[in-house]
């Protein structure tokens, strides 16, 4: 499928609107500090060049790869060295090393100001004044803050963002209409970003085989009626799409994702009975819908797995002939029978099966050796089941905020070297597993909870990788992708940690806390809780609870006071002294 001009090919496939949007996302994800106007200028230049190639594919430079064209364009940025430091060294390299270099400099936690939402009337005026610029700004601001956001999905978010403004800016109560929609998009966007970040980490840190194994398990759960060959084809295509997006090849990624959606809809009879509604939607909605589609019903009367994978005399022969195909079939057969298991559990089972075959197929009596392999699965299945049961009970007892606090204490004690903002962010997200998953019946709890926890722990891993401070975090993050959660669960209090020096400034609060939203106020209190544990890692739950209750009462009291600032100053000193005494600081 060779084209004389790759840039012309993609422009013709995607159209100018999508071409420009995707190039903007790509550039903003690479050069995260560049001003909006600079990116728009670069995008317009690339687009005009692409149009000359559409008109004549033999024109000068039209035969160059997209990486070469885009990299050359990024390297024209005058302030590259002063804004990005050593990233400027990438420009001295040749492709493909130059693109790899840009990828390595993507920053998961860029030093960018928090996005402040303007007044609704201000936003509506900006929207009406120039819809095109308004949408481009949205793409730019999200892409630079989320450098691995799944680009074709970001187009879908932008479409919904636009629809919200179109509807709400003509509503009687604009704010009541718009703000909940924007909140929903923000929350969904953060979740989408984190899910895609795990896919990219899986591909980049653990390789294509790891991603394909994940995809086989997930697609087999979702499409249990599909044949193994069909699932394998979907896995191959999906791997290509995500490899491209994670590699910064956003035009190819969006194009291939559209092709995959088209294929799935044309072949839905042999894939899933649940796709009908999705396939009636326009492209972006269709692709999103397919990605989120519910699991199809399992075929009736599926035979026991043991026959082919334990009892058969041909197990070692089949394994030796094509190891990954045989393991893929095992994973497919197990996953389609177990929509009640998390993907990571299914992958642990497949790994155990593989390890057993590696050992047993070299033994004197292979069959005797692997006959009890399924017995080894029992503890692997029970461990997440028990963990989820215990934590859901705790969540139901405490509610989300206090459940988050319990996790904050737990994780700060495990890895106290990790920065406080990271511990707060990650523990808050871990705590959301309760409201997200505990409401589900037993059969849906594990896939919801453990696969969500994989996404959240990956956030910890990528943030920690930027500035590594804990060998224990590094170990859990790098040893095994599927065992990250059990690895973190197994960590006990870090006995080697030297408690942090007490600093009264950390526990000094001001009247500005009173005007914060409930969420922001929670974050302030949770930040203080982490700092408290860092000072006194051996503090008991009861001690910490007492201090936090006093702290909550102190904030409530001073926020009701006439002279708030004086109250915070005077009562704050008393609280610090009382807390020090209570904790023996």
């Amino acid at each position: 499928d060779a084209h004389k001009s790759e840039v012309a090919h993609r422009f013709k496939d995607l159209g100018e609107e999508n071409f420009k949007a995707l190039v903007l996302i790509a550039f903003a994800q690479y050069l995260q500090q560049c001003p909006f106007e600079d990116h728009v200028k670069l995008v317009n230049e690339v687009t005009e060049f692409a149009k000359t190639c559409v008109a004549d594919e033999s024109a000068e430079n039209c035969d160059k790869s997209l990486h070469t064209l885009f990299g050359d364009k990024l390297c024209t940025v005058a302030t590259l060295r002063e804004t990005y430091g050593e990233m400027a060294d990438c420009c001295a390299k040749q492709e493909p090393e130059r693109n790899e270099c840009f990828l390595q400099h993507k920053d998961d936690n860029p030093n960018l100001p928090r996005l402040v939402r303007p007044e609704v009337d201000v936003m509506c005026t900006a929207f009406h004044d120039n819809e095109e610029t308004f949408l481009k700004k949205y793409l730019y601001e999200i892409a630079r803050r989320h450098p691995y956001f799944y680009a074709p999905e970001l187009l879908f978010f932008a479409k919904r963002y636009k629809a919200a403004f179109t509807e709400c800016c003509q509503a009687a109560d604009k704010a009541a209409c718009l703000l909940p929609k924007l909140d929903e998009l923000r929350d969904e966007g953060k979740a989408s970003s984190a899910k895609q970040r795990l896919k990219c980490a899986s591909l980049q840190k653990f390789g294509e085989r790891a991603f394909k194994a994940w995809a086989v398990a997930r697609l087999s759960q979702r499409f249990p009626k599909a044949e193994f060959a069909e699932v394998s084809k979907l896995v191959t295509d999906l791997t290509k799409v995500h490899t491209e997006c994670c590699h910064g090849d956003l035009l190819e990624c969006a194009d291939d994702r559209a092709d995959l959606a088209k294929y799935i809809c044309e072949n839905q009879d042999s894939i899933s009975s649940k796709l009908k509604e999705c396939c009636e939607k326009p492209l972006l909605e269709k692709s999103h819908c397919i990605a989120e589609v519910e699991n199809d019903e399992m075929p009736a009367d599926l035979p026991s797995l043991a026959a082919d994978f334990v009892e058969s005399k041909d197990v070692c022969k089949n394994y030796a002939e094509a190891k990954d195909v045989f393991l893929g079939m095992f994973l497919y057969e197990y996953a389609r029978r177990h929509p009640d298991y998390s993907v990571v559990l299914l992958l642990r089972l497949a790994k155990t099966y593989e390890t057993t075959l590696e050992k047993c197929c070299a033994a004197a009596d292979p069959h005797e050796c692997y006959a009890k392999v399924f017995d080894e699965f029992k503890p692997l299945v029970e461990e997440p089941q028990n963990l989820i049961k215990q934590n859901c009970e705790l969540f139901e007892q405490l509610g989300e905020y206090k459940f988050q606090n319990a996790l904050l204490v737990r994780y700060t004690k495990k890895v106290p070297q990790v920065s406080t903002p990271t511990l707060v962010e990650v523990s808050r997200n871990l705590g959301k597993v309760g409201s997200k998953c505990c409401k589900h019946p037993e059969a849906k709890r594990m896939p919801c909870a453990e696969d969500y926890l994989s996404v959240v722990l990956n956030q910890l891993c990528v943030l920690h990788e930027k500035t590594p401070v804990s060998d224990r975090v590094t170990k859990c993050c790098t040893e095994s992708l599927v065992n990250r959660r059990p690895c973190f669960s197994a960590l006990e209090v870090d006995e080697t940690y030297v408690p942090k020096e007490f600093n009264a400034e950390t526990f000094t609060f001001h009247a500005d806390i009173c005007t914060l939203s409930e969420k922001e106020r929670q974050i302030k209190k949770q930040t203080a809780l982490v700092e408290l544990v860092k000072h006194k890692p051996k503090a008991t739950k009861e001690q910490l609870k007492a201090v936090m209750d006093d702290f909550a009462a102190f904030v409530e009291k001073c926020c009701k006071a006439d002279d708030k600032e004086t109250c915070f100053a005077e009562e704050g000193k008393k609280l610090v002294a009382a807390s020090q005494a209570a904790l023996g600081l």
Partner: nanobody, 130 residues
Framework: HVQLVESGGGLVQAGGSLRLSCAAS???????RAWFRQAPGKEREFVAA????????YYTDSVKGRFTISRDDAKNTVYLQMNSLKPEDTAVYYC????????????????????????WGQGTQVTVSS
Amino acid sequence: HVQLVESGGGLVQAGGSLRLSCAASDTIDNYARAWFRQAPGKEREFVAAITWTFGTPYYTDSVKGRFTISRDDAKNTVYLQMNSLKPEDTAVYYCAASLYLPVRTASGGYRLDTDRPQYWGQGTQVTVSS
């Protein structure tokens, strides 16, 4: 081959309204849809366009504020709501599908050259009497 079919044209008095429709025979997700018009003895000119992904509208200066372009994803159809019609709006109105977007003019309106669209409809007559 994609076919574009226009409907909704007719005779209307000045100040009146008409709504044109353009249905596509097939999904062409990545193409902007546009309306052009050609008055007797004049060249075909751009009127309005809407992008397919985000639904961003573009208008030529002379119709801004009077005409509204919209789309229905599910029906694969584009509409041109024409209000406050003037005799100078009399023309054959053509629907088109274009990979390219309109470009901004110095006056702040938009234009799209007639060589840009990949697909054209047959046209529908709009006559505005004074």
